[in-house]
């Protein structure tokens, strides 16, 4: 039994890191393998993660971690019984994928303005809480070409757009994702989408 693709890990910079790897053949990850991990810290202890299958030869492990700080470094040991298959390390702050925003809501009762709000996925004491920026994706269910991205570079988790920038009388969907420039993170997954019917009063045309 050998590792074909070494484990690569990403952290949500809060409490979970996800590691994925591939073996050289079909493997029952949960029965044959264990990923041991430990924070390099005087008061830490070793933990064991039981991996799950992720395709025939692929394995994935969700590591429960202490609150992350930038200096953290974890040792990782992948075992098959008594055999050490791979040894490595992982700095969560260097491989961050933020959590997805939640509670996306479209408020359509503000005159002819659409107000989209969502929740920051981090608690106020987490470093990323004040460092997230967002991308909002709005698209038409009727017209695949009607697809747009709004970059929200301020900290407030909201976006205002004129309803008239979208077509009236049809349904739209929106979703939002996050990233943090400070740690050069990847984008989060998209939030669940929310749907609304866009309607507004056309301006009176004078002839």
């Amino acid at each position: 039994m050998k590792v074909l693709q070494e484990p690569t890990c990403v952290s949500d910079y809060m409490s979970i890191s996800t590691c994925e790897w591939k073996m050289n053949g079909p493997t029952n990850c949960s029965t044959e393998l264990r990923l041991l991990y430990q924070l390099v810290f005087l008061l830490s202890e070793a933990h064991t993660c039981i991996p799950e299958n992720n395709g025939g030869a692929g394995c994935v492990c969700h590591l429960l971690m202490d609150d992350v700080v930038s200096a953290d470094n974890y040792t990782l040991d992948l075992w098959a019984g008594q055999q050490l298959l791979w040894k490595g390390s992982f700095k969560p702050s260097e491989h961050v994928k933020p959590r997805a925003p939640g509670n996306l809501t479209v408020h359509t009762n503000v005159s002819d303005t659409l107000l989209l709000t969502w929740s920051n996925p981090y608690p106020p004491d987490n470093y990323l809480y004040n460092h997230l920026t967002y991308a909002v994706n709005i698209w038409s269910e009727n017209d695949p070409a009607d697809f747009r991205i709004y970059n929200v570079t301020y900290l407030e988790p909201s976006l205002r757009i004129a309803a008239s920038t979208l077509k009236s009388g049809i349904s739209y969907r929106a979703r939002v994702r996050a990233w943090a420039q400070c740690y050069n993170t990847t984008w989060s997954e998209w939030s669940p989408s929310t749907k609304w019917h866009n309607s507004y009063r056309e301006p009176f045309e004078q002839h």
């Epitope: 409490s15 005087l42 830490s44 202890e45 202490d66 609150d67 930038s70 953290d72 608690p123």
Partner: antibody, heavy 115, light 109 residues
């Protein structure tokens, strides 16, 4: 807002015992290492003890064998049991959250050791 | 055990002046594990700088940290009245634990 609220200081005779408490709020207590740091009157800061999220502990040589740090994650609380107290243990004791450094501190509680 | 020595013991300056505080370690310290604190009379210490040069949340940008190896510096670019206090450096070591310097008092001249 992260808060650490301390209680349990007071006057004790040499050789006596005292238990300090620290209640945390505004953060996930169970995912953070916790510490005690003290400051003798007019002196500098001295690290006393620390406890990891899994219960691993460490002590300064000056208190080893006399002090015991513990935590109750269900109550978001940190404790320091101090036995065989000496005159040199007299100080303001601070609880703190942290790891390699201490990012949040309690208000401090004075422990006076005097006959 | 790593010993941290701060200098000077006392720094007498006027508001608006630049303050430079030194922290020297008896052996090499990882920059990731070097921090600075401010303490005012009757108050708990407050984290200013961690990782030798990163400002903690809410700390004004007049505070900056630098250095590596055995020599570290805290600089206050322009002293405000509220900056007069005692400053401590602190390091963490995987075997020896946590140690503080003896402190530098920044007082009004």
């Amino acid at each position: 807002e992260v808060q650490l609220v301390q209680s349990g200081g007071g006057l004790v005779h040499p050789g006596g015992s005292l238990r300090l408490s620290c209640a945390g709020s505004g953060f996930t207590f169970s995912r953070n290492a916790m510490f005690w740091v003290r400051q003798a009157p007019g002196k500098g800061l001295e690290w006393v003890s620390g406890i990891g999220t899994g219960g691993a502990t460490s002590y300064a040589d000056s208190v080893k064998g006399r002090f015991t740090i513990s935590r109750d994650n269900a109550k978001n609380s940190l404790y320091l049991q101090m036995n065989s107290l000496r005159a040199e243990d007299m100080a303001v004791y601070y609880c703190a959250r942290g790891r390699y450094y201490f990012d949040y501190w309690g208000q401090g509680t004075l422990v006076t050791v005097s006959s | 055990e790593i010993v941290l020595t701060q200098s000077p013991g006392t720094l007498s300056l006027s508001p608006g002046e630049r303050a430079t505080l030194s922290c020297r370690a008896s052996q090499s310290v990882s920059s990731s594990y070097l921090a600075w604190y401010q303490q005012k009379p009757g108050q708990a210490p407050r984290l200013l700088i961690y990782g030798a040069s990163s400002r903690a949340t809410g700390i004004p940008d007049r505070f900056s940290g630098s250095g590596s190896g055995t020599d570290f510096t805290l600089t206050i670019s322009r002293l405000e009245p509220e900056d007069f206090a005692v400053y401590y450096c602190q390091q963490y070591d995987h075997s020896a634990g946590w140690t503080f310097g003896q402190g530098t008092k920044v007082e009004i001249k």
